[in-house]
């Protein structure tokens, strides 16, 4: 089971936020019927990533990758997913 | 289903104190620059988001966790 497959929509939203990609975020939020106030809240989080620059997105991507590939999550997500997320995080 | 450790990370990012959030990230042997960045992002989110914003973010997360896409 790939890590993103454990909850693909969560990782879609997370990487859209961390990437500073508004279009991608809107697209992901539409899939879960987000309300306007919910969209506004997520865009405020996205602003923090954008203001901190690319390294901020990479570093926080590292946090998510590290936690998602930790022993705590290994029951739900198997090791081979680490490489996938690492590529997503660092290949930007 | 989302991994509980990831859910805990996101919950603390929104509702915890900066110290609580950074301590939680530190449990995963994060690099010093990663911890510093985590604190800066947490402080930024706390400054930008009202309590209502955070409630809206949490309700969105509930939608995500209960979605058929999760």
């Amino acid at each position: 089971v790939k890590m993103a497959e454990t909850c693909p929509i969560f990782y879609d939203v997370f990487f859209a936020v961390a990437n500073g990609n508004e279009l991608l975020l809107d697209l992901s939020l539409t899939k879960v019927n987000a309300t306007e106030p919910e969209r506004t809240a997520m865009k405020k989080i996205q602003d923090c990533y954008v203001e901190n620059g690319l390294i901020s997105r990479v570093l926080d991507g590292l946090v998510m990758t590290t936690i998602s590939s930790s022993k705590d999550c290994m029951g739900e997500a198997v090791q081979n997913t680490v490489e996938d997320l690492k590529l997503n995080t660092l290949g930007r | 289903e989302i991994c509980p450790a990831v859910k805990r990370d996101v919950d603390l990012f929104l509702t915890g104190t900066p110290d609580e959030y950074v301590e939680q990230v530190a449990q995963y042997k994060a690099l010093p620059v990663v911890l510093e960045n985590a604190r800066i992002l947490k402080n930024c989110v706390d400054a930008k988001m009202t309590e209502e914003d955070k409630e809206n973010a949490l309700s969105l997360l509930d939608k995500i966790y209960t979605s058929p896409l999760c």
């Epitope: 901190n52 620059g53 690319l54 390294i55 990479v58 570093l59 590292l62 990758t65 590290t66 690492k86 995080t89 660092l90 | 042997k29 690099l31 010093p32 620059v33 510093e36 800066i40």
Partner: antibody
Framework: QVQLQESGPGLVKPSETLSLTCTVS????????WSWIRQPPGKGLEWIGY???????NYNPSLKSRVTISVDTSKNQFSLKLRSVTAADTAVYYC??????????????WGQGTLVTVSS | DIQMTQSPSSLSASVGDRVTITCQAS??????LNWYQQKPGKAPKLLIY???NLETGVPSRFSGSGSGTDFTFTISSLQPEDVATFYC?????????FGQGTKLEIK
């Protein structure tokens, strides 16, 4: 190819301020962390501090009270100021770039170093 | 601060010899350790990152291993151009700290 070049006076008087600049060429200063590291003659390496292009800094506690690192993104430069110098601050000063990945934080590019002597 | 203790401080070996340098951290740093080579009058050069990963373009005779507090750097077959001082560097905690260096000479 990224290149780093330190510049500044090679001789500083005791109690004065040591000022050095690192010019980055062949790449942008943005989106990286940048460090100053020094090496007294015949001795080992000591990390002084780093700066992120946004201006965020972190200093070695042993030097924190005397150090300021700043950045000028328009010139692709970052600078070091070390106040109230003594003979113990005589060293080769290097600037270096951090490369950060999921589990690694290393200095992948270095300047050639500049010797600063503290003497009256 | 995390103290990095490198040994030996100097060593002399013959061309073709296997050379081993150790580095001990005063506390657990996982695998957050790099090795650098510094030739006389030059800036240090990254050889190994993350305790065991060989930097691109670095000859495969160089290798690193270890985790926690004990780390090893090895040159499998010493070459004349390897004359230098080698430093370990921990990045598990701030401030970043270096070992005192190991000066390697050819017999």
């Amino acid at each position: 190819q990224v290149q780093l070049q330190e510049s500044g006076p090679g001789l500083v008087k005791p109690s004065e301020t040591l000022s050095l600049t690192c010019t980055v060429s062949g790449g942008s200063i943005s989106n990286y962390y940048w460090s100053w590291i020094r090496q007294p003659p015949g001795k080992g390496l000591e990390w002084i501090g780093y700066i992120y292009y946004s201006g965020r800094t972190n200093y070695n506690p042993s030097l924190k009270s005397r150090v300021t690192i700043s950045v000028d993104t328009s010139k692709n430069q970052f600078s070091l100021k070390l106040r109230s110098v003594t003979a113990a601050d005589t060293a080769v000063y290097y600037c270096a770039r951090h490369r950060i990945t999921r589990t690694a934080d290393s200095f992948d590019y270095w300047g050639q170093g500049t010797l600063v002597t503290v003497s009256s | 601060d995390i103290q990095m203790t490198q040994s030996p401080s100097s060593l002399s070996a013959s061309v073709g010899d296997r050379v081993t340098i150790t580095c001990q951290a005063s506390q657990d740093i996982t695998n957050y350790l790099n090795w650098y080579q510094q030739k006389p009058g030059k800036a240090p050069k990254l050889l190994i990152y993350d305790a065991s990963n060989l930097e691109t373009g670095v000859p495969s005779r160089f290798s690193g291993s270890g985790s926690g507090t004990d780390f090893t750097f090895t040159i499998s077959s010493l070459q004349p151009e390897d004359v230098a001082t080698f430093y370990c560097h921990q990045y598990g905690d701030l401030p970043y700290t270096f070992g005192q260096g190991t000066k390697l000479e050819i017999k």
